[in-house]
Interface confidence: medium
């Protein structure tokens, strides 16, 4: 299947130009998406190009500015949040990034009713997290690891927690490992639907070992960054969940929610919290050995002012072939009766599907089925359930949006997106207004992305929100590479791959091949999405063929493929990349003397192991910020897939799967090792140990570090990185500069 057909005929080719590295580094061909900031069933906010905050009413067709760029600019605001009663807007400035999701900022509250900033009882700075209640204009915020509550923006704050301490106790915000590997958010507090209660997590990191690294900065002495970071097998954070009545916060104070007994008996995690009603909450817990998850539904007892979590409302999810869930354990979507819910988990055939749980998990009703996977439940209304899946035409790398009519019997299923813009759009996500009255579809490709607005009842398209016309025009004279997505059938395993081919690709010629790999558990690289990036340039300008392959351990093709890597990371992912390369060589257009592999993070680990596989297939390769030993990486992530690094568990494979153990095998390849010294995620330690092992084995290699850069290698480092890698590959492939 050719996803991006050549745009032009040969007669026009002389007016066309290839992509340049500069195009990529400048983001010349980046695209825009439009996600409405829904504030009701038919209204949304959007920040206009000139930075006014505009309210759109779909039904009246009217729009007006609720906050001007002038006011935004007066406090250098880069973000905003409207209170649900529409009386106030918080303006966020002085953004200072911390980890992947977390940042601190200064907040100003603008009073729309008075047309002025709220004066008196101003918020402290910098704030770690701030949010409005779901109804009205109460404020909850986290400052110096403690939670505060304001009944109104101008009121004095009520302090909810007092034990917060940097790097020790975190209230309402996650510590490093919960942020990165469990919650995937900057916050750990949750308002009940009408703002009566506020739930929050407290993380105790007192006994967690600390990773310390130098941050060089500009001073005479570097400073040391200290982060409580549990590596595999280390002491983990201890978590507790509390709920406070925000109407009378001082009355009983925060009440702790009990942990299910079967979870509390050993080390455990809290994985998510979902409010059902103001007086019913659902918590999800996970054993440290992450194959058992418990969903617990708790109710408020007015007479005792406590939260009760009866055993009859505990639902256990267990995996016998791998870990619980996909990347994370899925979260429930409750129906209107406030007790039954919809949830995605593995069916008896080992495919992730939507189930309806009324009383027990054993009696769950399967809503979707087939040799494909349901990926996300977007919204459940009284008569419809909207979800995404990769069912259509059996392409795992696609995403279409479906509607199941749950009000009718039998429930009827309709693909909302499959035939909308079939060539252009095969990978969608959606954003729904209240009660799914309207929704936005955001199509990511394979053609140029487009965002559209739809009627939630009829699915009729109302208008185009963003179609990237400027991008389309800019690409008219660019020779883009061709892309195709196909599959290889090898030993009962299906290996989907994406191949990016030079614009004038000729099967009778030989091309250098670059494998781009990620390959981490529950990831997917072969997706029908639009991208003009570094590898597009390598194909367009430098005439390389680039391939991405989804091997064992990758997602959305069933548990057999996903859980194949359980307790054995670093084996099958590498084997499958090598198998694919051999198949590509058999296709006849690959120069087998010029094959390279590169990857970042988990991909850096896989590319390193592939280079050190001793197959002789790869001439060279690059590892950016690689993991080199699973003992160096975070407990929550690593143990999910590898178990514990103890003798009676999986220590042997922890030791066997390191890059360092294969140092000798790098002797006959050109290896470029790259890492940021301030990487809080995959610590520089990983590359330091690879380098040490290579030096000890007297193996020559190339390396580049990026001072004070984290796992993302952003800013000017990005330009330097891609320029450096380009030179390395061109040298490897004997391509002239």
């Amino acid at each position: 299947i050719v996803l991006r057909p050549p745009r032009v005929h040969n007669s026009e080719e002389n007016t066309m130009r290839a992509l340049t590295l500069k195009d990529i580094l400048n983001g010349t061909f980046s695209y825009k998406t439009f996600f409405p900031n829904w504030i009701s069933g038919q209204e949304y906010l959007h920040q206009s190009a000139d930075n006014n905050i505009v309210l759109y009413n779909i039904e009246t067709g009217q729009s007006y500015t609720i906050l001007s760029n002038r006011t935004m600019k007066s406090v250098n605001a880069s973000n905003y949040g409207l209170s649900p009663d529409r009386q106030f807007v918080y303006l966020e400035s002085d953004y200072s990034k911390l980890w992947r999701y977390s940042y601190t900022a200064t907040y100003y509250i603008y009073d729309l009713s008075n047309g002025e900033f709220v004066r008196g009882n101003e918020l402290p700075r910098p704030i770690q997290y701030l949010c409005w209640s779901p109804v009205g204009s109460k404020l909850a915020y986290v400052y110096q690891n403690n939670i505060y509550l304001k009944q109104r923006p101008g009121d004095p704050p009520f302090q909810i927690t007092f034990n917060g301490r940097e790097n020790k106790i975190f209230n309402g915000i996650p510590d490093w490992v919960y942020e990165e590997e469990m919650l995937a958010t900057k916050y750990a507090l949750w308002w009940s639907p009408n703002g009566k209660f506020l739930a929050y997590a407290e993380f105790n990191d007192t006994d967690i070992p600390v990773i310390a690294y130098s941050y060089y900065g500009d001073e005479q002495y570097p400073r040391t960054i200290n982060i409580p970071y549990p590596k595999a097998g280390a002491k983990n954070p201890f978590v507790r969940i509390f709920i406070i009545d925000t109407t009378y916060p001082a009355y009983v104070g925060p009440q702790e929610v009990p942990v299910p007994a079967m979870i509390a008996s050993s080390d455990y995690y809290f994985s998510w919290l979902t409010w059902v009603t103001d007086e019913r909450v659902c918590l999800q817990w996970l054993k440290r050995v992450q194959n058992v998850s418990v969903l617990s539904i708790c109710d408020f007892r007015e007479d005792w002012q406590t939260w009760d979590c009866p055993k009859t409302q505990e639902h256990i999810e267990e995996s016998r072939t791998g870990w619980a869930g996909g990347f994370f354990v899925s979260t429930p979507v409750f129906s209107y009766d406030a007790i039954s819910y919809y949830k995605i988990f593995s069916d008896k055939d080992g495919y992730k599907h939507i189930h309806y749980i009324k009383d027990t998990v054993e009696n769950a009703i399967q809503i979707t089925s087939g040799k494909w996977e349901a990926i996300n439940i977007f919204r459940v209304t009284q008569d419809s359930l909207f979800y995404s899946s990769n069912e259509f035409e059996d392409y795992p790398g696609r995403r279409n949006i479906y509607r199941i009519s749950i009000g009718s019997y039998p429930p009827s299923k309709k693909c909302v997106t499959c035939h909308l813009r079939k060539e252009r759009c095969q990978y969608y996500t959606a954003s729904f207004s209240d009660y799914a009255k309207y929704y936005a579809l955001v199509c990511y490709g394979p053609g140029i992305p487009i965002s559209t607005l739809h009627d939630g009842r009829t699915d009729q398209e109302i208008k185009i929100l963003e179609e990237n016309k400027e991008l389309e025009n800019a690409l008219k004279n660019i020779q883009l590479p061709k892309e195709e997505i196909k599959k290889l059938e090898v030993d009962e395993i299906t290996l989907w791959y994406k191949m990016i081919l030079p614009p004038q690709f000729d099967r009778s010629k030989k091309y250098p091949l670059l494998i781009q790999v990620y390959g981490g558990p529950c990831s997917q690289s072969v997706r029908s999405v639009f991208a003009v990036n570094w590898i597009s340039y390598l194909a367009s300008k430098e005439g390389m063929v680039i391939a991405l392959v989804d091997g064992r351990g990758t997602a959305f093709q069933g548990d057999k493929l996903l859980y194949a890597v359980y307790r054995k990371l670093g084996v099958y992912e590498v084997e499958d990349q090598i198998t694919a390369v051999r198949k590509f060589i058999e296709m006849g257009f690959i120069d087998e003397k010029r094959i390279a592999i590169w990857g970042w993070s988990y991909g850096g680990y896989v590319s390193s192991l592939a280079l050190a596989s001793g197959t002789g297939l790869f001439k060279c390769g690059i590892a950016v910020a690689p993991v080199s030993s699973w003992e160096y990486y975070a407990s929550v992530y690593t143990e999910r897939f590898m178990g514990l690094p103890t003798k009676d568990d999986n220590l042997e494979h922890y030791k066997n799967s390191t890059v360092m153990a294969r140092a000798e095998y790098f002797r006959n390849v050109d290896y470029l090792l790259i890492h940021g010294t301030a990487d809080d995620n995959v610590h520089f330690q990983n590359s330091a140990q690879i380098a040490k092992a290579l030096v000890n084995a007297q193996v020559d290699f190339q390396a580049m570090w990026y001072s004070d850069q984290n796992h993302g290698l952003s800013g000017l480092s990005t330009n330097h990185l891609y320029t450096h890698m380009t030179h390395f590959l061109k040298q490897c492939f004997s391509l002239s500069d």
Epitope: Y64, T65, L67, S68, T71, L112, S113, G115, R119
Partner: antibody
């Protein structure tokens, strides 16, 4: 029903004082800024004074600065305009109005019926 | 202060006519422009806010447009109850200022 009712108008001599009141009902009074607007006989509308929801912030038109003081009692849902050193040119119908919330450029969405102030010797 | 200038000062029209009133600001006021209707002896009534948004309860024959400095109020089909004086008002900056008014009379 949302409404504003002004009172306190009447005849006053130049240099004299008058206090206008505006009773609000049907909405959360303390959440909204309020204004006074006047209209001289046969003329257009002229903004006079405004006050924030909390009452902590007021501002006046240059023509009345130092002479008129606007205040509010949120516990009584009442708005006031204290007018001192009155002049003949202050003769007008005085309206109180509510400033709409929900967006920054708030319009005046609810108006009272007006009260006539006549300054004459 | 921002000056608001309305034109015409007055106009005569018949029932069913399409009527257009313009309002010009002395500097850009974005879309922070409101229109009011006032009948003799009555308080003003909000018709249009934020240049083009119809206030709830106002008939759809009234519409507003414009941004920056030039704005228009249109009555698509004049009804007997529409004979009144119309005022524009900017809420971009303090003090809020009104136009001098446009009187719509029966022809």
């Amino acid at each position: 029903e949302v409404q504003l009712v002004e009172s306190g108008g009447g005849l006053v001599q130049p240099g004299g004082s008058l206090r206008l009141s505006c009773a609000a009902s049907g909405f959360t009074f303390s959440s909204y800024a309020m204004i006074w607007v006047r209209q001289a006989p046969g003329k257009g509308l002229e903004w006079v004074s405004a006050i924030s929801g909390s009452g902590g912030y007021t501002f006046n038109a240059d023509s009345v600065k130092g002479r008129f003081t606007m205040s509010r009692d949120n516990s009584k849902n009442t708005l006031y305009l204290q007018m001192n050193s009155l002049r003949a040119e202050d003769t007008a119908v005085y309206y109180c109005a509510k400033r709409d919330g929900g967006y920054e450029g708030g319009a005046f969405d609810i108006w009272g019926q007006g009260t006539l102030v006549t300054v004459s010797s | 202060d921002i000056q608001m200038t309305q034109s015409p000062s007055s106009l005569s029209a018949s029932v069913g006519d399409r009527v257009t009133i313009t309002c010009r600001a002395s500097q850009s006021i974005s879309s922070y422009l409101n229109w009011y209707q006032q009948k003799p002896g009555k308080a003003p009534k909000l018709l249009i806010y934020a240049a083009s948004s119809l206030q709830s309860g106002v008939p759809s024959r009234f519409s507003g447009s414009g941004s920056g400095t030039d704005f228009t109020l249109t009555i698509s089909s004049l009804q007997p109850e529409d004979f009144a004086t119309y005022y524009c008002q900017q809420s971009y900056s303090t003090p809020p200022t009104f136009g001098q008014g446009t009187k719509v009379e029966i022809k």
